[in-house]
């Protein structure tokens, strides 16, 4: 759909990972002085919903509040921006939003190896495991958008895993890692401990996750 | 003015398939929502399932899942219903209704109808 | 067997007040707002009342809707001759994931 108008941001207020009963705030906005904003969860008929937006400083927007948060508000959304009503124009639409809904199921454990003070330079995997069945596990590191995402591989020891290759360490973060199914991938478990990782030898305590550009061309290590 | 404007009415076997058309004229037609809905002589409403043509978005009723399905094609404003492995209980009149974006479900305009009969 | 539940049937005389009942459940009416539609002899239902009790332009303020838990009524004032019609409610169902309709109720003007 191209729209007669530029596409719309959408953005999660306080992040697109939401906990079974909290509510996020979708804020969809523009430079496009939009008198509505529709916000679209994919595949459904019924629920667009519908605000007048808002003008500021030659900002239009629009704060949607989902929530409380149950896994049929989780999914993927788009907003779209109107200048008219009956019949809507709609702009193009913004990217997707992926909406998360976590707090499911139990939390897996998540360690590093080969722990979690390491030297610059080098080599850190972290690991993430469960007793529960999980298909997928994802990896946050505080302060990130995105998550990456590994299967998990067959049980050993009684516990499903995913490692996640971190490379040569530069700096540190705190990282947190969820399970889920299949079937379900917009339903995460319990957030694991988070997990401080620090970086021996560098100044700095942030660390490139592995969602960031690897080297300067910016391209992308998308581990999905 | 807004107007819905349907294909004529049909005689169909049992076991085969069936597909109405509904254009619409009077309004942008990607920008709302198209449900059908049909009715038995004599008998009551039945919600068989919509389209949202801008978001490529089609809902079913559970009754009609894998039996129906909805199109349309925003060249020609024209929405597409079609039902296939008709039986006798088939027999109805089948409405196209349009509704808003936000209020998909609310039917504002209904079209004239067509008149489905299913009979060996 | 419609999921929402109606009176088949309703009268009265030119002038009476005129309740037509709604009948659902948490998933339907509980958690969702109620249409009324009216459908004369012959031709296409037509809205008459939205999100429980809106009258869209051009219908007299003789008819009026109204929710209450997982029940909703439509009530027709001073009726007359031409309010013969059948009339059905309408509400989104979330465990069905489908708008639902009542059987409808056919209303009849005594003379």
């Known amino acids: 759909h191209e729209g007669v108008h530029r596409k719309p941001s959408l953005l999660a207020h306080p992040g697109r990972l939401v906990k079974s009963e909290e509510t996020v705030i979708l804020q969809c906005w523009s430079d496009v002085r939009f008198e509505h904003f529709l916000l679209h969860r994919e595949g459904k008929f019924k629920d667009t919903l519908h605000l007048i937006g808002e003008h500021h400083d030659g900002v239009s927007k629009a704060n949607f509040s989902i929530g409380p948060m149950m896994q049929d508000l989780a999914g993927t959304y788009r907003c779209y921006g109107s200048v008219t009503h009956s019949p809507y124009q709609l702009s193009a639409p913004s990217d997707p939003l992926d909406i998360v809904i976590t707090g499911l199921y139990e939390k897996p454990s998540l360690s590093a190896q080969p722990g979690p003070t390491v030297l610059a330079g080098e080599s850190v995997t972290l690991s993430c495991s469960s007793r529960s069945s999980y298909d997928m596990y994802h990896l946050s590191r505080e302060g990130e958008a995105h998550e990456c995402r590994f299967s998990a591989g067959p049980k050993v020891n009684g516990t499903f895993q995913a490692d996640f290759p971190l490379g040569p360490a530069t700096h540190g973060g705190t990282y947190r890692c969820f399970g889920s199914f299949r079937d379900s991938p917009y339903e995460w478990s319990n957030s694991s401990d988070p997990l401080l990782v620090s970086v021996i030898g560098n100044p700095s305590n942030s660390w490139p996750s592995p969602t960031e550009p690897s080297s300067k061309t910016g391209n992308p290590r998308h581990l999905h | 003015e807004v107007q819905l404007v349907q294909s004529g009415a049909e005689v169909k076997k049992p076991g085969s398939s069936v597909k109405v058309s509904c254009k619409a004229s009077g309004g942008t037609f990607s920008s709302y929502a198209i449900s059908w809905v049909r009715q038995a002589p004599g008998q009551g409403l039945e919600w068989m399932g919509g389209i949202i043509p801008i978001f490529g978005t089609a809902n079913y009723a559970q009754k009609f899942q894998g039996r129906v399905t909805i199109t349309a094609d925003e060249s020609t404003s024209t929405a597409y219903m079609e039902l296939s492995s008709l039986r006798s209980e088939d027999t109805a009149v089948y409405y196209c209704a349009r509704g808003e974006l936000d209020t998909a479900i609310r039917f504002d305009y209904w079209g004239r109808g067509t008149l489905v009969t299913v009979s060996s | 067997q419609s999921v929402l539940t109606q009176p088949p049937s309703a009268s009265g005389t030119p002038g009476q007040r005129v309740t037509i009942s709604c009948s659902g459940s948490?998933?339907?009416?509980?958690?969702?707002?109620v249409n009324w539609y009216r459908q004369l002899p012959g031709t296409a239902p037509k809205l008459l009342i939205y999100s429980n009790n809106q009258r869209p332009s051009g219908v007299p303020d003789r008819f009026s809707g109204s929710k209450s838990g997982t029940s909703a009524s439509l009530a027709i004032s001073g009726l007359q001759s031409e309010d013969e019609a059948d009339y059905y409610c309408?509400?989104?169902?979330?465990?069905?994931?489908?708008?639902?309709f009542g059987g409808g109720t056919k209303v009849t003007v005594l003379a």
């Open positions: 309408a509400a989104w169902d979330d465990s069905l994931n489908g708008v639902v």
């Open positions: 948490s998933s339907n009416i509980g958690s969702n707002t």
